[in-house]
């Protein structure tokens, strides 16, 4: 955790006046001046009744305030006298002294209250050297501390038992610890006083630092009896448009020409391509123009534009119907969902002066007329020797971002003219053990004379398919077997080529000893 | 084109029925008869019938009366063999065909305990 | 029923060069229509029959023409003219005449 922060109450090393504190009796302590190791002059306060026995020797410091503190630490310093080094002296000779400490709500002591005794004066510890010294070393300075809590009152005195060990008590400080305001987790937490015990954990709630958010709660830290942070709860981290510094101490601001589009730990990042921040602390980078973002992008994409036109668009008429194919755009606006929308305009009129209008509805596409994949696409259904516009757009995921239409290329197309239209309907008129004869009506739309017409017709059973063709609008099939069902289909021929075969409609031979008689029947398409 | 998608291999017991399936797709599906062929692992083929999809109009191979039932469900271009009270014998390779033209890949039907 | 009667192997026959597989029936298979209901396939190991030949000599749509069939009401005949590896399978006749649609035995074309 953080190194922890200790508060002085009192100290004497820093007193160079008297410090008269009270010693009872007064043939006790003593107060002296003397010289710390570092030769600065303090005031000291000595006993060595070594030579009487029953010693009880007391000494009080002033009132020390409390400073709402639950636990206070005693530092001494000391000398001890070894007993061994001292001649012809008594057995009680003590190498020891008691530490006591008396609370109050003000300073009320005097030189006979409380009493110079345990009870009411509270023991902390008896106190013992690490060394001692005799008359022929340097005195070694003992270095002690303790403490003792919690405190409720006021203030407090702190009182030393000599009961007959040859001593000096060079310093006293008084003080309490703290934990250090710090910043953890992007969170920031007060400087807090430790607790009564010395395993008490005082709980100090943080806030998010400057442009922080939180990301779990509480926020809380634990102050130890030491002074020292342990155990985080909850964290903040950096909101969008900042990012870590300092250690995580800090969440800074994304510069100009950077950004984050995420609250959180990660830092500031270029912007993508084709887009810009103009102030700091952006949490996405605005598109240039003519350059968009599409609903589906993420802030972390590039912003891209509308691609340039198909290229290459190449028609092949067929009659009515035809087929165009295209190149891919020279240009794909830097996005890989590019699709393609044809729109048919049929035009009236004669060379520049012709006005154009969109299709009709019974104008089909094959795959489809938009959002196409493929570079090509199958249309029929236009009327013959008629003018038309065909218009291929590429489009992609921002172009209905641009306030634009998208780019296309056209090309300009005349039909030809057209193949019949289906044959309607088949009547049986007819039929046999080994024989079908079939009459239909001509196409509704012949589009020019009729040559012949061809007849396609397989066993269901085998479904495999003969040819057989007619100049007139009826037939007789023969070879076929009895009992068996005939799957048969007609189409019409002009000098435009085929037309298309009529819907598959069924009939049926009789069995080899049947009459053959006639069957009149109009066969609907199945 | 024309595509003929027969159900998955199957592992049956003994005695009970089993119903394999055959997808027709690419063409009109009533205007062709479905044939039903079987093939023991190596033997040769057996014809077992057809049916016509336009009316399940049916013709059986006598030896598989009574031990197969053509169906069809027009709706969803599907024909349908049933096989009942099966022994180790009905353990063959079924396979369905669009007349004398195109032929299933085939379902492995295993009768065994 | 029709029996239709095919031998099991064929002579073994090089690569390149040309084979025969023969097949019989029980009943002449010419129709009065003038057609004759004989149909060959070839099963590829693993794979599902495949049509080679319909009413006799009709080559099926999609068939190399290395591939003929022949023959009178009852003896039929199929040949490759130059056999290739992916000609490798059992090859069966079919008659189409009558119920119920018998095949023959089928004949493994075997190369040398």
């Known amino acids: 955790g953080c190194r922890a922060l200790e508060e002085t109450l009192m100290d004497t090393k820093w007193v160079t006046s008297e410090l008269a504190w009270t010693s009872h009796p007064e043939s006790g302590w003593e107060e002296v001046s003397g010289y710390d190791e570092a030769m600065n002059p303090i005031r000291t306060y000595q006993v060595c009744n070594v030579r009487e026995s029953s010693q009880n020797n007391w000494l009080r410091t002033g009132f020390i305030w409390r400073r709402d503190v639950q636990r206070v630490y005693v530092e001494l310093k000391f000398t001890v006298r070894d007993c061994n080094s001292i001649p012809n002296i008594p057995g009680s000779c003590k190498e020891t002294f008691n530490l006591f400490y008396y609370e109050a709500d003000s300073d009320v002591a005097s030189a006979s209250s409380p009493f110079w005794m345990e009870n009411p004066y509270v023991k902390v510890d008896t106190i013992a050297p690490d060394e001692s010294f005799s008359r022929l070393d340097a005195g070694r300075v003992n270095t002690k501390v303790r403490s003792f809590g919690p405190l409720s009152k006021a203030g407090f005195y702190l009182a030393f038992q000599d009961q007959g060990a040859c001593m000096s008590l060079i310093s006293v400080r008084a003080f309490y610890k703290k934990c250090a305001s710090t910043t953890a987790g992007f969170a920031l937490f007060p400087e807090t006083l430790t607790g009564a015990e010395p395993t008490s954990l005082v709980i100090a709630p943080g806030t998010c630092i400057p442009n922080a958010v939180e990301v779990s709660v509480p926020l809380k830290l634990y102050c130890n009896g030491d002074g020292e942070w342990m155990v985080p709860v909850g964290a903040c981290t950096c909101a969008t448009g900042h990012e870590p510094a300092a250690k995580e101490s800090q969440c800074r601001p994304c510069p100009p020409g950077s950004y984050k589009a995420k609250q959180g730990e990660g830092p500031c990042l270029p912007c993508p391509p084709n887009s810009r921040t103009t102030s700091p602390a952006a949490s996405i980078c605005t598109c240039h123009n003519n350059f968009y973002r599409a609903d589906s992008d993420s802030a972390d994409s590039a912003c891209t534009t509308v691609p340039s036109p198909p290229r290459g668009v190449i028609s092949n008429v067929n009659e009515t119907s035809l087929i165009l194919e295209w190149s891919e755009p020279r240009d794909l606006g830097g996005r890989d969902d590019l699709l393609y929308n044809v729109i048919c305009k049929k035009c009236h009129g004669a060379g520049g002066a012709s006005a154009c209008s969109r299709c009709d509805d019974n104008v089909e596409f094959v795959p489809r007329q938009l959002g196409l994949t493929e570079r090509r696409v199958h249309i029929s259904h236009l009327l013959a020797h008629t003018r038309y516009t065909f218009e291929v757009q590429a489009v992609n995921g921002v172009s209905g971002k641009s306030p634009l239409p998208p780019r296309y290329a056209a090309v300009n197309i005349t039909t030809n003219q057209a193949a019949p239209s289906e044959v309607p309907t088949l009547r049986l008129h007819s039929s046999s053990g080994s024989s079908l004869t079939l009459s239909w009506a001509p196409p509704e739309r012949p589009n020019g004379v009729i040559l012949d017409y061809e007849m396609k017709y397989f066993e269901k059973s085998e479904g495999i398919a003969s040819t057989v063709t007619s100049q007139m609008n009826s037939v007789q099939l023969d070879g076929l077997r009895p009992d068996a069902r005939y799957v048969v289909q007609v189409r019409a021929r002009t000098v435009a080529g085929y037309g298309q075969y009529s819907r598959p409609a069924e009939f049926e031979t009789t069995s080899e000893r049947g009459s053959g008689a006639q069957q009149l029947q109009e066969q609907l398409p199945l | 084109q024309v595509q003929l998608q027969q159900s998955g291999a199957e592992l049956v017991m003994p005695g009970a029925s089993v119903k394999l399936s055959c997808k027709a797709s690419?063409?009109?599906?009533?205007?062709?008869?479905i044939h039903w062929v079987k093939q023991r692992p190596g033997q040769g083929l057996e014809w077992i019938g057809e049916?016509?999809?336009?009316?399940?109009?049916?013709n059986y191979n006598q030896k598989f009366k009574g031990k197969a039932t053509l169906t069809v469900d027009k709706s969803s271009s599907t024909a349908y063999i049933q096989l009942s009270s099966l022994t180790s014998e009905d353990s063959a390779v079924y396979y369905c065909?669009?007349?004398?033209?195109?032929w299933g890949q085939g379902t492995t039907l295993t009768v065994s305990s | 029923d029709i029996v239709m009667t095919q031998a099991a192997f064929s002579n073994p026959v090089t690569l390149g060069t040309s084979a025969s597989i023969s097949c019989r029936s029980s009943?002449?298979?010419?129709?009065?229509?003038?057609?004759?209901?004989l149909y060959w396939y070839l099963q590829k190991p693993g794979q599902s029959p495949q049509l080679l030949i319909y009413?006799?000599?009709n080559l099926a749509s999609g068939v190399p023409d290395r591939f003929s069939g022949s023959g009178s009401g009852t003896a039929f005949t199929l040949r490759i003219s130059r056999v290739e590896a992916e000609d490798v399978g059992v090859y069966y006749c079919?008659?189409?005449?009558?119920?119920?649609?018998?095949f023959g035995g089928g004949t493994k074309l075997e190369l040398k």
């Open positions: 079919m008659q189409h005449l009558e119920y119920p649609l018998t």
């Open positions: 009943k002449s298979l010419l129709h009065s229509n003038g057609i004759t209901y």
């Open positions: 049916i016509d999809p336009s009316d399940s109009y049916t």
């Open positions: 065909a669009r007349g004398a033209e195109y």
């Open positions: 009413r006799m000599s």
């Open positions: 690419g063409y009109t599906f009533t205007s062709y008869y």
